[in-house]
Interface confidence: low
């Protein structure tokens, strides 16, 4: 399993799939969107990524969606943040949630090959789909919460989709919403939001002896 | 690129103030974290103090109080005040920027580093 040392005092070490999910709207700018990626690259820092334990992709959605990390993937922590911090800016008019849950209920999460993992989509949303694109925006959401799909709204500005935001924290307890004035608040919000997605995640059970060499205590 | 220079540092006594400052060239600045590290003689190098691009700061809690960290992005300039000096404060500092917007406290995080700038402080 590749791995590499810690980075920072807090660091998960849980059994968890996580899904980065990137608003490449025009309503962040170039430099807004730069300030986007270093959150996720900094999350990863205090990630024990590995096939074993903490699991990422990251996707950037349009109106469309661009996977740059798939959960299968095996590099190096580092090789993984070094692709996270070049993803592009799409800067495009339309980002739709609807699309981006779709893709992660029907290509990330279609087979649930960790069923003792976690798994959980951070939604980073900074604006607002047109209404034709969310008429299945519930549906997706619903189905998410049938595999066990913890969805986590991170919303930025003053243009994200609030609406949407409460309509996912009513479907799962879990569902816990975290709305931002600007992606300036991000790093104040780090810990807490690293900190909320470990805790749902469960820690690996202890090595189970193999069969032969179970103890047998004699009384 | 990102080059570091840093300037400020000298000789001063026990109880003193100095300021350190760093100036940075590369169009990018107002992009990068930017961090101080410290270096005694025979000893590993330490964080200091770091401030993001948004002046979001954090410093080494047996520092906190009497170092500030501050930064002009149009200048391209960051700045290191230190109050009440300790012979213990002896050391070289340097200056180090990272390729993204978020501070982190740990040396292997930063692409980009000065030369240093000595300060001492005697008793």
């Known amino acids: 399993d590749i791995s590499e040392p810690p980075l920072h005092d807090f660091y998960c070490s849980r059994l968890l799939d996580l899904v980065f999910l990137l608003d490449g709207s025009s309503r962040l700018s170039e430099a807004e969107f730069e300030v986007l990626k270093a959150f996720v690259v900094d999350m990863m820092e205090r990630l024990r990524i590995s096939q074993k334990w903490v699991r990422v992709a990251v996707v950037e959605y349009h109106d469309g969606s661009h996977a740059y990390i798939g959960l299968k993937d095996r590099k190096r922590p580092s090789e993984l943040r070094r692709i996270a911090s070049q993803v592009k800016y799409a800067g495009s008019q339309v980002a739709s949630t609807s699309e981006v849950l779709k893709y992660t209920l029907f290509q990330i999460f279609s087979k649930i090959d960790r069923p003792e993992a976690s798994r959980i989509a951070l939604l980073l949303m900074a604006s607002q789909e047109p209404q034709r694109m969310s008429r299945n925006f519930v549906r997706y959401v619903q189905g998410l919460k049938k595999k066990k799909v913890i969805v986590i709204p991170v919303g930025i500005g003053p243009h994200a989709n609030l609406k949407q935001i409460r309509l996912i924290e009513k479907q799962a307890p879990e569902n816990k919403a975290f709305v931002l004035s600007s992606v300036d608040e991000l790093e104040q919000q780090r810990d807490e939001i690293v900190s909320y997605l470990c805790d749902l995640a469960p820690e690996a059970p202890p090595p189970t002896l193999p069969p032969h060499m179970a103890q047998v205590t004699v009384g | 690129q990102v080059q570091l220079q840093e300037s400020g540092g000298g000789s001063v006594q026990a109880g003193d103030s100095l300021t350190l400052s760093c100036a940075a060239s590369?169009?990018?600045?107002?992009?990068?974290?930017m961090g101080w590290f410290r270096q005694a003689p025979g000893k590993e190098r330490e964080f200091v103090a770091a401030?993001?691009?948004?002046?979001?700061?954090e410093y080494a809690d047996s520092l906190k109080g009497r170092f500030t960290v501050s930064r002009d992005n149009a200048k391209k300039l960051v700045w290191l005040q230190m109050n009440g000096l300790k012979p213990e404060d002896t050391a070289a500092y340097y200056c180090?920027?990272?390729?993204?917007?978020?501070?982190?406290?740990?040396?292997?995080?930063?692409?980009?580093w000065g030369q240093g700038t000595q300060v001492t402080v005697s008793s």
């Open positions: 180090a920027a990272r390729r993204g917007a978020f501070t982190a406290t740990t040396a292997p995080l930063y692409d980009y």
């Open positions: 401030i993001s691009p948004s002046a979001f700061t």
């Open positions: 590369g169009r990018t600045f107002s992009m990068h974290a």
